[in-house]
């Protein structure tokens, strides 16, 4: 779990000729607000598709009235950050849409007057816990300057907010292979560390220190393609009679992959792993630059400004290959037992267990409360063959050992500030907003929401509703 934070620095005319007209006037003063929509991966989805990672709406900015004859300056902005909480792992690659909306403050007797001024979108890679990333985007004659970052909420840490911090078992140091959990130095990080040298592309681990290979790869570090390793050593794949499997003619015989590509057999045919600068079924397409978009499945292309220099595809979790063309599906092996849900996080497998089961692979049947301790005043509750800890206020997790942060899961709307409280959370609303989560504007000025859209018109389209 964590929070994506967006700081708008300025919104105003971009450089160059053709300065935009001021969005406000002396007759119709207005104010701005912003909406951010986040989607996982590097998808180029339509603007109206769901904000699967989350979304947020800012408070209203100060009222602005155009000065006659003056050029449109940077417009006054709302205070504070836009915060988008995320419950699961931070995906590392994401798409964003930032919309600038204008709210007109003239006496609107009829319906709302609410119009979209600018919409920018982009696709980025971002590690959680890193520094603020600065960005400039242009929409027509407007320019938006902003910074963003993703940060984990305790007890989660790491670039994807998937590693957890735990209180130290010994007062002086962490256990073997465990590091202090910055910035919570009194706690220990519990990362999943594979065997040193285990291929990050072709290997994975379910227990610390191991290296298990994806289909088509072998060797202690999963660096050897199966098709070239069969029978190269006496310990290769063997049968009881011959001691070695000698394959018949296969689709990789004669290596159909051009330009130095390596061939591996698939159940139906073959697959070429191409060197950088080449792609295609047989690595026959060359002279590729990032401008050609060689990275598939949302891979981020780096380098390769001209045909002579190589490019590198940085693949999002769940994909591999020199062009991110291969999907990694380790859940197809059904590693989670007892009906557990398999989650492939890219760098590791996780099983989300059904009630009553636990363990890395949901292998433990938790049939009663015997021998189970709930920390921090929590009580064990059993029922239906399952049991759980009912935690005291302020604590959460399976054993009530995690400090619960109610603000991480329930944000306040319209720029409201969230405070953890012994009874849950409190939203301190920006002026002009009410509700447990600041979701109700007291005086919407006829302008703070989308009307029921006429047929064929979606909320969020840049029409003006009157």
């Amino acid at each position: 779990a964590g929070v994506f934070e967006l700081q708008i620095h300025s919104f105003g005319p971009g450089p160059g000729p053709g300065a935009p007209r001021s969005p406000c006037s002396a007759r119709l003063p207005c104010r701005l607000f912003f909406r951010v929509c986040l989607k996982p991966g590097l998808s180029e989805e339509a603007a109206e598709s769901p904000c699967a990672l989350g979304a947020a709406l800012s408070a209203r900015g100060p009222v602005y009235t155009e000065q006659p004859g003056a050029p449109a300056p940077d417009l006054p902005l709302p205070d504070g950050l836009l915060q988008v909480p995320f419950r699961d792992a931070w995906p590392g690659t994401f798409s964003f849409i930032i919309e600038t909306w204008r709210e007109e403050l003239g006496d609107q007797i009829g319906g709302p007057a609410w119009s979209l001024l600018a919409r920018v979108a982009g696709r980025r890679r971002l590690a959680a816990g890193g520094p603020w990333a600065r960005d400039i985007q242009r929409a027509g004659a407007w320019e938006l300057r902003f910074s963003y970052r993703a940060r984990c909420e305790p007890p989660a840490v790491g670039t994807a907010c998937t590693r957890l911090c735990r209180p130290r078992s010994a007062p002086s140091r962490c256990g073997p292979g465990l590091r202090p959990c910055a910035p919570l130095e009194d706690e220990c990080e519990a990362p999943l560390v594979c065997r040193a040298g285990c291929s990050p592309e072709h290997g994975f681990c379910e227990q610390p220190g191991e290296c298990r290979c994806l289909e088509g790869w072998t060797g202690p570090l999963c660096t050897v393609p199966v098709s070239t390793s069969s029978c190269l050593s006496p310990r290769g794949p063997s049968s009881a009679t011959t001691g070695c499997l000698v394959p018949g003619p296969g689709p990789c015989d004669g290596n159909p992959c051009a330009n130095g590509g390596s061939c591996s057999e698939t159940p139906r045919s073959f697959e070429c792993t191409c060197p950088r600068g080449f792609y295609g079924l047989r690595c026959e397409v060359s002279g590729v630059t990032c401008a050609d978009g060689p990275c598939f499945n949302g891979g981020l292309c780096v380098g390769g400004a001209d045909p002579d220099s190589a490019y590198i595809c940085h693949c999002p979790p769940g994909f591999q290959g020199s062009n991110c063309e291969k999907r990694v599906d380790r859940c197809s092996l059904q590693p989670c037992r007892n009906g557990g849900l398999c989650l492939d996080l890219g760098h590791a497998l996780r099983c989300r267990c059904r009630a009553g089961f636990a363990g890395p692979r949901c292998e433990h049947d938790l049939d009663d409360c015997a021998g189970r301790a709930c920390a921090n005043g929590g009580t064990c509750v059993e029922g239906g063959g399952a049991h759980r800890c009912s935690c005291a206020l302020g604590f959460g997790g399976r054993d009530c050992r995690e400090r619960a942060d109610p603000c991480a899961a329930r944000p306040c709307a319209h720029g409201g500030r969230c405070y953890a409280h012994f009874s849950g959370l409190v939203c301190a609303c920006a002026p002009g907003y009410m509700g447990a989560r600041c979701e109700f504007p007291v005086h919407p000025d006829g302008a703070s929401a989308l009307p029921a859209a006429p047929p064929g018109l979606r909320p969020g389209d840049p029409q003006r509703y009157l």
Partner: nanobody, 117 residues
């Protein structure tokens, strides 16, 4: 896409009662924060009462003790029970929904309430 349809408005005498309904479609009302606003002729639209997605409620001072907002998840509707109505309660009443997933607010088309003898 969230659609809101208000009903239940009409003419009522001072001191009388009325119940407004807001039927939502496109998503479950339990996922929304829903409020009633009103706009009297020549005045700005103002909040009357709201119910958050967690069930907590909020009222403006002028209607506390007289109006009650409630939610029926099975019927996917939110209601405003208005008692002890006064002439100053005359207005067009609008249903408003705040959809948390996409941080988008929506309006209904409004229903007229007239309090007059």
């Amino acid at each position: 896409e969230v659609q809101l349809v208000e009903s239940g408005g009409g003419l009522v005498q001072p001191g009388g009662s009325l119940t407004l309904s807001c039927a939502a479609s496109g998503t479950a009302v339990s996922n929304l924060s829903i409020a009633w606003y009103r706009q009297a002729p020549g005045k700005k639209r103002e909040l009357v009462a709201g119910i958050s997605d967690d069930g907590s409620t909020v009222y403006v001072d002028s209607v506390k003790g007289r109006f009650t907002i409630s939610r029926d998840n099975a019927k996917n509707s939110v209601y405003l029970q208005m008692n002890s109505l006064r002439a100053e309660d005359t207005a067009v009443y609008y249903c408003y929904a705040y959809e948390w997933t996409n941080a988008l607010p929506y309006w209904g088309q409004g229903t007229l309430v007239t309090v007059s003898s």
